[in-house]
Amino acid sequence: NSYYDKVLAHSRIRGRDQGPNVCALQQILGTKKKYFSSCKNWYQGAICGKKTTVLYECCPGYMRMEGMKGCPAVMPIDHVYGTLGIVGATTTQHYSDVSKLREEIEGKGSYTYFAPSNEAWENLDSDIRRGLENNVNVELLNALHSHMVNKRMLTKDLKHGMVIPSMYNNLGLFINHYPNGVVTVNCARVIHGNQIATNGVVHVIDRVLTQIGTSIQDFLEAEDDLSSFRAAAITSDLLESLGRDGHFTLFAPTNEAFEKLPRGVLERIMGDKVASEALMKYHILNTLQCSEAITGGAVFETMEGNTIEIGCEGDSISINGIKMVNKKDIVTKNGVIHLIDEVLIPDSAKQVIELAGKQQTTFTDLVAQLGLASSLKPDGEYTLLAPVNNAFSDDTLSMDQRLLKLILQNHILKVKVGLSDLYNGQILETIGGKQLRVFVYRTAICIENSCMVRGSKQGRNGAIHIFREIIQPAEKSLHDKLRQDKRFSIFLSLLEAADLKDLLTQPGDWTLFAPTNDAFKGMTSEERELLIGDKNALQNIILYHLTPGVYIGKGFEPGVTNILKTTQGSKIYLKGVNETLLVNELKSKESDIMTTNGVIHVVDKLLYPADIPVGNDQLLELLNKLIKYIQIKFVRGSTFKEIPMTVYRPAMTKIQIEGDPDFRLIKEGETVTEVIHGEPVIKKYTKIIDGVPVEITEKQTREERIITGPEIKYTRISTGGGETGETLQKFLQKEVSKVTKFIEGGDGHLFEDEEIKRLLQGDTPAKKIPANKRVQGPRRRSREGRSQ
């Protein structure tokens, strides 16, 4: 079934309560326009945003019988001439008579007649109509023949994009059959279709078809009022393409439309080949879109690649929400033209600052006022991270101008970064030299503390992304941030007692749920000593408050639980509800405090992993005193497992080797290297090891290479020569394979040859070593440092 037939079937269903073969039509209030009712229009009770009244009429082909409900009788079948009378197209019938067409359409043959309604003839320009009436034998006959096809074609045969030769000089009739059930012939709508005749079919249309001999190009070249558009089309090498075969829709801006553009904007675009071509192509669709087919808002892809929304308000057509079409449906042999009184400017032709919308005017105004707009050169590439208007508080706006300028500089990047270019862990540099971190979540992208809202756009010299808040680059580490806030003094002291201070100082990506002093209310000094006394317990509790990765509260999908694994090993449950972050269902007091190595969410209760039992009565008593939101399990005698902290040590440890090298046990995450002078070169890549993707970090100084795997880091060491160097090289050749992986609570396990080769990327030949052999030399003091 065709779209037309489907909509007709829907109308029939809506009308069946009124009797057999009754169709429901919707008439737009204040007009004579009627449409068979589609499902959407029926429920909306409106077409083109205008209210409709429901009319019940006989479905095409049926008629009423006196005293009976509905339309139980079938319309009589007659020849095409007689059928014109049956469907009420009496003016067309009369013209067919006087032009001597009558004999033809009463006789043998098979015809399709697109018959203008009586109203269509009344709406025809009076001069044109008079001209036809003054020359019935030629002009009128030709005009009527141009409404006819030499075979019967029902709406199901009228396929979208078809061009059917008419009976006048084979001039093309452009058929469009739209998904909303509208069928048009040269943009005239079929208002009553499929009236079968003995020698064909009659479709009533809503306007008289005028003869088409010209292309879009021809029309543009002849129309003085389109001279600006014509010139722009020539400049963009597009005019000739509008003379080729196709089914185009052109929204052609008049000269007046060009006059509305600020002259500077026009001069800039016309001086830029890429922008001017984009501008022109943005006015062209590769599909034929008649105005009569627009019964609601729909999005169409333009030749430029971006989309425009075409809608309607009563009889007016709107583009991107603005009423601007002042002449519709100029049909040509390769498409249709609608004249518009505004120039459509695609994002791709706009300067980055012009991409901002109504919700970012505070940002753009400030950028202009503080002299930053002039630094956005047309031939440069930038990214604006534009906060919405309400992100700017009165306090911010009343700041010293120099400070405000620095804040704004944090929102302009030196390069063009599109939405699809952003990835988690990315570092972006601002024009002020600050570095911003990107965090990508399931349903959000955030930069530092601020998350994006919809509306990213790409322009000629940059991109714009819209943010909920002002972006505040972090200045301090997690540890420094806690230290400067008195609320965290108890937590900080426990952290230091647990030897975890380094963890919050060094570079990394962490989420810390920091309990305030309120979380420890009522804890006595004896109880504090008890807690500190069991280092494993203390570490387990503290590390349950720490999660690898930066998780910003605003980045969470609202209302759903996010399950994260903490550094301690147990799960923690996060949920964003009404702008508040719930941590294990406890309300966070403050969230998204950004630091250089992570983010802090403030909680006023101590958190505890529900799956970890306590085996000490006193500790249980203390924890029950502090933690009320869960029932802590008690298993007598159970102890907290030791957490291997080596996993979280800095990536690179510098060892000063004094004299001959000795053997030592390498724990997880440690590396042995010679002292390095100068900055190492760092390269990161991913390698598949045993089917698992492993991020490999290479740091190179001369020939030195450190390979970091997920669990253990191995180092190949070589030096530039000298006695120590030779000794080292000999040592390496002989003893490189004497490496053990220490597994907490288990036996040492040695890698096989192939494994070591893989890990060392085939660099070092390794001997096979008997399993469980541990090699260890006397311990020496070593100076430990961290790579910068």
Epitope: D224, S227, A231, E259, R263, L266, R268, K377, P378
Partner: antibody, heavy 118, light 110 residues
């Protein structure tokens, strides 16, 4: 063919006003704008401003703002430029030019010499 | 004082190629298109090139325009005696919100 015919030469005293006309033919007057450009003797060209023959909207050069007025009469397809408070440095040949915006100043009038002298 | 800078004169023998340069700033040529006008002695100017490199119908292809950064140039190849004229470059100036012309270059055919 497109033609722009300007009024004849004028001699004015300092402080006076001058009104130069520019009659268009050979095209649809209201479909285009008109720009006015002047050239002092032996000097370069200076843009004075623009008027839309369709809407009457104007855009004047900052330097002349307040002293210049551009108008059109669509019934006669004529554009006018009036310059007030004339000074000796306003002595120049004044040109009107058809301005399609996309193709600026594609046809020019023959020019009107305005001499400001006491 | 013109905003756009042009060399005051250029010359060449018939058949040669002469190039006229025009230098501006980021607010005029740097941001916007350049147009060129030819003014034969004692006549009104005539549009020669618009939008950096477009020739209106009727202008011979011996005339070509180009733009790079904040400068533009007009090349006249196959120089003819009829090309002896003043040549002006012009562009919109964003900072002045005004259409600005160059000082003009007198091209002489030797």
């Amino acid at each position: 063919q497109v033609q722009l015919v300007q009024s004849g030469a004028e001699v004015k005293k300092p402080g006076a006003s001058v009104k130069v006309s520019c009659k268009a033919s050979g095209y649809t007057f209201t479909s285009y704008g008109i720009s006015w450009v002047r050239q002092a003797p032996g000097q370069g060209l200076e843009w004075m401003g623009w008027i839309s023959a369709y809407t009457g909207n104007t855009n004047y050069a900052q330097k002349l703002q307040g002293r210049v007025t551009m108008t059109t009469d669509t019934s006669t397809s004529t554009a006018y430029m009036e310059l007030r408070s004339l000074r000796s440095d306003d002595t120049a040949v004044y040109y009107c030019a058809r301005d399609v915006l996309v193709v600026p100043f594609d046809y020019w009038g023959q020019g009107t010499l305005v001499t400001v002298s006491s | 004082q013109s905003v756009l800078t042009q060399s005051s004169s250029a010359s060449g023998t018939p058949g040669q190629t002469v190039t006229v340069s025009c230098s501006g700033s980021s607010s005029d040529i740097g941001s916007n298109r350049v147009n060129w006008y030819q003014q034969l002695p004692g006549t009104a100017p005539k549009l020669l090139i618009y939008s950096n490199d477009q020739r209106p119908s009727g202008v011979p292809d011996r005339f070509s325009g180009s733009k790079s950064g904040t400068s533009a140039s007009l090349a006249i190849s196959g120089l003819q005696s009829a090309d002896e004229a003043d040549y002006y470059c012009a562009a919109w100036d964003d900072s002045l919100s005004t259409y600005v012309f160059g000082s003009g270059t007198k091209v002489t055919v030797l």
